[in-house]
């Protein structure tokens, strides 16, 4: 990803707000201009910044995926939060697609936890109630799982 | 402790060309994300371009769009500011610096105004 053809956008349009930096660091929603002499507002839907700072450009919004639901749009201060549609799940150690929950548990074993944005179904066996880590069943059962509703946001 | 030795400064005419280079020791180079800052006579420091640590991500100042380009040479622990279309008003010292705590956010560089390491300064005066 370069930058240079989106700085243009994101410097200080007429419209934008300023104000003056405090302790050199502009408050949530703004960055510092290229003097260092102003704060200057970010773009609501293109940018944001959420924290005091001393950035040059506001933070790009993320934009959902194909495959992904936006819970909450970027606003000047908060990134857009974006969720896994359902019947598929992001993992912590994939984060960077959405993999579809498997229909069921493989024989010999029992569904204990639902398909989440988050989170595959969850498989123990039946007698020993260990968990199943195999990524893909050997045989099938016809157990459906139910989509979870809470939100993680993506970055 | 990186250390930053800016050249190529000096004295051209309008419309003229210059290319400055900051040479880093001390540090890693290919882990350094840099910029470049100016400062003329009687003003304060003004950001002027930056480029991630390995070159993918880059940003300019309005004012110098068009006519700069930053670059870098990680094997050979360098980095470039290519200046063409020379103004006076581009008379400044100019800093070669180091964002020792740089923003990432989804893999994007974010250059700061308050990077934190400096060299000493290259004098680049654009007169007829």
């Known amino acids: 990803i370069t930058q240079q053809d989106l700085a243009p956008q994101q410097r200080a349009a007429p419209q934008q707000k300023r104000s003056s930096p405090s302790e050199g660091l502009c408050p949530p929603g703004h960055h510092i201009s290229e003097d260092g002499r102003d704060c200057i507002s970010c773009k609501y839907g293109q940018d944001y910044s959420t924290h005091w700072n001393d950035l040059l450009f506001c933070l790009r919004c993320t934009r959902c995926d194909s495959g992904e639901v936006e819970l909450s749009p970027c606003t000047t201060t908060r990134n857009t939060v974006c969720q896994c549609e359902e019947g598929t799940f992001r993992e912590e150690d994939s984060p960077e697609m959405c993999r579809k929950c498997r229909t069921g548990c493989p024989r010999g074993m029992v569904k204990v936890g639902d398909c989440t944005p988050w989170s595959d179904i969850e498989c123990v066996h039946k007698e020993s109630g260990t968990k199943h880590s195999g990524e893909v069943p050997a045989v099938e059962e016809t157990v459906t799982s139910s989509p979870g509703t809470p939100a993680s946001p993506c970055s | 402790e990186v250390q930053l030795l800016e050249s190529g400064g000096g004295l051209v005419q309008p419309g003229g060309s210059l290319r400055l280079s900051c040479a880093a020791s001390g540090s890693t180079f290919s882990s350094l994300d840099m910029g470049w800052f100016r400062q003329a006579p009687g003003k304060g420091r003004e950001f002027v371009s930056a480029i991630s640590r390995s070159g993918d991500n880059i940003y300019y100042a309005d004012s110098v769009k068009g006519r700069f380009t930053i670059s870098r040479d990680n094997s050979k622990n360098t980095l470039y500011l290519q200046m063409n279309s020379l103004r006076a008003e581009d008379t400044a010292v100019y800093y070669c610096?180091?964002?020792?705590?740089?923003?990432?956010?989804?893999?994007?560089?974010?250059?700061?105004?308050?990077?934190?390491?400096w060299g000493q300064g290259t004098l680049v005066t654009v007169s007829s």
């Open positions: 610096a180091v964002d020792s705590q740089p923003t990432y956010s989804g893999g994007v560089y974010y250059p700061r105004y308050g990077m934190d390491v």
